[in-house]
């Protein structure tokens, strides 16, 4: 399956809309950074198939989407700016859908990429729960932006090689 | 507010298979992985296995795999789960469970089918 | 697969008595991923405790829990005639996700 060529161009959008959400300095809040534990061996996009790294992709990207939907969310950013986000990654989620479904009736979710999708859920969990423990404070939020650039450009790398691939 | 929807209850006879469903409601159905729960009268939960209404991705319990098939219908925003062969060990009540994270793992439950295997 | 183990399988307290339940688990689980659900007879199960010691919305101070690695426990306080249901402990720390049998916890 090919991603259009606009997937990347919703990339390198949605990782600018992220970039100007930024409230508060990053440096006012460096007591509260936190190590994540970005699942990166899951996207350095080696050990497993194009038609795997898709599905991983794809849970990335969703849960992205669904940190971003929530009241809390709401509250923590300027309205238009999250709303042109979620748009971004909404049609991202559409293309890498289109993907994934093709190989559904081809093979069930291999035995590598269930625990991919694992690491991914879990490093999302961790970012649930620094948000609870910190009861969604601006620092909290402006921390979970930055780690989230981070990981959007790790999954627009692993998308530029799967593209080198083809 | 989120509600997964599930018939009472389903008679079937030793042998033959069975199509569970779940209709969810309040939330964006496509955008949380729905899970399928197993408790038989009296006993534990035993997970049987998860599907991404997105694109149909399913992950199973290797216990249930030859037992139990996930699918979805987006148009109806329903999850279903065919189970076959069905046998007295299969007399349960099955949920289904809304996956998401930290208080919002499986913080949403249907009330649960029970599956009586009965001649 | 990870076997959760719960202790005991019945248990009986007076209004006020202060009770702990117990889950061991047959390898580590990361505390983020063990979950504790409250189930009474006829209902579905509804989430209790996440990531180990977080109560759920709705759920009384009264309850708390801990742990970490292959031993986790929930508490309770006082004893409350609400209190009486069957508690689940649920791990989805590695594939198959699995619970425990349950502790089936009675108001004397």
């Known amino acids: 399956c090919d991603l259009p060529q606009t997937h990347s161009l919703g990339n390198r959008r949605a990782l600018i809309l992220l970039a100007q959400m930024g409230r508060i300095s990053h440096f006012s809040c460096l007591k509260d950074r936190h190590d994540f534990g970005f699942p990166e061996e899951e996207f350095d996009g080696h050990q497993f198939q194009k038609t795997q790294a898709i599905s991983v992709l794809h849970e990335m990207i969703q849960q992205t989407f669904n940190l971003f939907s929530t009241e809390d969310s709401s509250a923590a950013w300027e309205q238009s700016l999250l709303e042109k986000f979620s748009t971004e990654l909404y049609q991202q989620l559409n293309d890498l859908e289109a993907c994934v479904i093709q190989e559904v009736g081809v093979e069930e979710t291999p035995l590598m990429n269930v625990d991919s999708i694992l690491a991914v859920r879990k490093y999302f969990q961790r970012i649930t729960l620094y948000l609870t423990e910190k009861k969604y404070s601006p620092c909290a939020w402006e921390v979970v932006r930055a780690e989230i650039m981070r990981s959007l450009s790790f999954s627009t790398n692993l998308q530029k090689r799967l593209r080198r691939k083809d | 507010q989120v509600q997964l929807q599930q018939p009472g209850a389903e008679l079937v006879k030793p042998g033959a298979s069975v199509k569970l469903s779940c209709k969810a409601s309040?939330?964006?159905?496509?955008?949380?992985?729905m899970h399928w729960v197993k408790q038989r009268p009296g006993q534990g939960l035993e997970w049987i296995g998860e599907?991404?209404?997105?694109?149909?991705?399913?992950i199973y319990n290797e216990n249930f795999k030859s037992k139990a098939t996930l699918t979805v219908d987006k148009s109806s925003i329903t999850a279903f789960m065919q189970l076959s062969s069905l046998t007295s060990e299969d007399s349960a009540v099955y949920f289904c469970?809304?996956?998401?994270?930290?208080?919002?793992?499986?913080?949403?439950w249907g009330q649960g089918t029970l599956v009586t295997v009965s001649a | 697969q990870i076997v959760l183990t719960q202790s005991p399988a019945i248990m009986s307290a007076s209004p006020g008595e202060k009770v702990t339940l117990t889950c061991s688990a047959g390898?580590?689980?990361?505390?983020?991923?063990l979950y504790w659900y409250q189930q009474k007879p006829g209902s579905s199960p509804k989430l209790w405790i996440y990531?180990?010691?977080n109560l759920a919305s709705g759920v009384p101070a009264r309850f708390s829990g801990s742990g970490s690695g292959t031993s986790y426990s929930l508490t309770i306080s006082s004893m409350e005639a609400e209190d009486a249901a069957s508690y689940f402990c649920?791990?989805?720390?590695?594939?198959?996700?699995?619970f425990g049998s349950g502790t089936k916890l009675e108001i004397k």
């Open positions: 990531s180990t010691s």
């Open positions: 309040g939330y964006t159905f496509t955008n949380y992985w």
């Open positions: 469970a809304r996956g998401g994270l930290g208080p919002a793992w499986f913080a949403y």
């Open positions: 649920h791990q989805w720390s590695s594939y198959p996700f699995t």
């Open positions: 599907i991404n209404p997105s694109h149909g991705r399913t």
């Open positions: 390898s580590s689980v990361d505390s983020s991923y």
